[in-house]
Interface confidence: low
């Protein structure tokens, strides 16, 4: 009489999650007497997953008719696959006795489970900086088996190199993590780009998964200032303007001051977007030239975005002033002018 | 312990056709017994394999619904479905070294199938 | 879908000389692979199992080697009985049972 055999015939089997395992499992022979086990692991410490004569096993069933006469098939199917269901998987044969006493067990089926990243997030700087510094982008996802997963940056279509990635644990595990930090290096014309994050897997078949970032989050583009006198007209006032240029974001405060005492205060708002994103924005002043006896100082004060003030400071001449003055008064710059 | 298959003729496209495979010397069913097939001139492709102590096969992905294979005590058969031009071939049973662990240690001499108008 | 890729397609060498032919598979097999030859009009003949253990009967002039993806064959101090078509074969189970395409070994 040839030796009995428990033949698991699939050394492994991978299985998408959500989805239902068939682990094959059949023996050469009836004799002897005695029940079939499936185990998870080997050893002591091995797992119990289905015993026919006692237990719940509410997730797995038997694929043919166990109390079947004759049945030497034993392979069982496990509904609703988790991650946490990896592993190796062992039928093991019983010879009947009290207690029953382990005969012969299967070579084993490795069962891993194709789980699908979650989509990547990207979270950008907490703070904004200007051009010509770099921000970090980071992206991340989780959830997802096998370990073998493809995470590419672009920024406006085009791959990103400063890149680190690191896949979490590096030992084997049921599921994995993704995270990677992009450095870009941002540029005044960066309102309107944007970060891409695209992870692939084996469970996307082929469609990758993306994350984004809007460089507008991460970018702070200071104002140029130029302050102009226009022609003075017949009644005796100037008009002086504070043409600011090229910001972002809108978030800004201009003050007037005529020789450093407060005239005016304003406050950006519903601007006109430029076709690179950036604002601009213009502020008159009308100075009297007949009420001072002295050259007037008018200063442009400009706060952006939480920065330090920049100044750009202008002399209306009035110790002649005849009808028709023209735009050649002197302007001074007495603050730093952010490029 | 050998193996001979039979059945191998010609046939015209879409007639049914059942190849057989007879083992001596070891029961089927302590071992599989797989399928393998090689067109004229070219390389061997596995078909399928049915399993010892029960009635589990496996096909490889292209002749799913194309092949059916079967067993008694004693023979194992190959069913061609509907056969095309494309199944003009050679075709060999193998015994599996031991049942789960399918190289092929015997071989029978192969039977020439032959699908033609 | 998993393959297995064999290189060269032939090989020509003479009688006392030495062949090598490569067997690479698109994903892990660990070391379920098997090398057979076969000459013309025959079945194949059972050379290697588990990639490198010789099969019954076999000239250790004959070594596998290799495990996970890449199994190289040698052919070693070559007789003109060696000339045959020589086929790798993957049985990582049912999904993976495919044999390579072969490489033909011409004998000078």
């Known amino acids: 009489e040839e030796e009995l055999q428990v033949i698991q015939p699939e050394k492994s089997v991978s299985v998408a999650a959500g989805d239902s395992a068939t682990l094959n499992c059949t023996v050469s022979s009836l004799i002897p007497v005695g029940p079939i086990q499936w185990f998870r692991g080997a050893g002591p410490g091995r797992e119990l997953i289905y015993n026919l004569k006692e237990g719940h096993f509410p997730r797995v069933t038997p694929v043919s008719d166990p109390t079947k006469r004759n049945n030497m098939d034993f392979s069982i199917r496990i509904s609703n696959i988790t991650p946490a269901d990896a592993g190796t998987y062992y039928c093991v044969k019983f010879r009947k006795g009290s207690p029953d006493v382990e005969l012969k067990s299967g070579a084993g089926t490795e069962l891993s489970v194709r789980a699908k990243p979650s989509a990547p997030v990207v979270s950008g700087p907490a703070v904004r900086a200007t051009a010509e510094h770099t921000v970090s982008f980071t992206c991340e996802s989780h959830g997802f088996s096998p370990r073998d997963i493809t995470l590419k940056w672009f920024k406006n279509g085009n791959e990103l190199s400063d890149v680190q990635t690191n896949v979490d644990p590096a030992g084997k595990s049921v599921s994995y993590s993704i995270r990677s930090t992009a450095r870009v290096v941002l540029t005044r014309r960066d309102v309107h780009s944007q970060v891409i994050c695209e992870v692939a897997h084996v469970t996307l078949q082929g469609d990758p998964l993306r994350g984004t970032a809007n460089l507008s989050e991460a970018i702070r583009v200071p104002p140029f200032l130029e302050v102009t006198q226009q022609s003075m007209r017949a009644d005796n006032q100037v008009n002086v303007t504070c043409q600011v240029t090229k910001f972002y974001p809108q978030r800004l405060q201009l003050t007037w001051l005529e020789n450093g005492n407060v005239s005016r205060t304003e406050m950006a708002s519903a601007l006109p977007e430029n076709k690179d994103g950036t604002y601009n924005w213009t502020s008159w002043l009308l100075v009297n030239v007949s009420a001072h006896r002295d050259d007037v100082k008018l200063t442009c004060q400009v706060e952006h975005d939480g920065q330090p003030a920049v100044n750009k400071s202008f002399s209306v001449k009035v110790s002649a002033h005849p009808k028709e003055q023209g735009s050649n008064t002197a302007a001074e710059n007495t603050g730093t002018n952010e490029r | 312990q050998s193996m001979e298959e039979s059945g191998g003729r010609l046939v015209t496209p879409g007639t049914p056709l059942t190849l057989t495979c007879t083992a001596s010397?070891?029961?089927?069913?302590?071992?599989?017994v797989s399928w393998v097939r090689q067109a004229p001139g070219k390389g061997l492709e596995w078909i399928g394999i049915i399993y010892g102590g029960s009635d589990i096969t496996a096909y490889a992905s292209w002749a799913k619904g194309r092949f059916t294979i079967s067993k008694t005590s004693t023979t194992v058969d190959l069913t061609i479905t509907s056969p095309t031009t494309e199944d003009t071939a050679t075709y060999f049973c193998a015994k599996s070294y031991t049942n789960g662990m399918d190289y092929y240690n015997i071989w029978g001499p192969g039977t020439l199938v032959t699908v033609s108008l | 879908a998993f393959d297995l890729t064999q290189t060269p397609s032939s090989v020509e060498a003479p009688v006392g000389g030495t062949v090598i032919i490569k067997c690479q598979a698109s994903q892990s097999i660990s070391s379920y692979l098997a090398w057979y030859q076969q000459k013309p009009g025959q079945p194949p003949k059972l050379l290697i199992y588990s990639a490198s253990t010789l099969a019954s009967g076999v000239s250790s002039r004959f070594k596998g080697s290799g495990s996970e993806t890449q199994f190289p064959l040698t052919i070693s101090d070559l007789e003109s009985a060696d000339a045959a078509t020589y086929y790798c074969q993957s049985y990582y189970g049912s999904r993976s049972n495919v044999f390579g395409g072969g490489t033909e070994v011409v004998v000078k």
């Open positions: 010397g070891f029961s089927l069913s302590n071992y599989g």
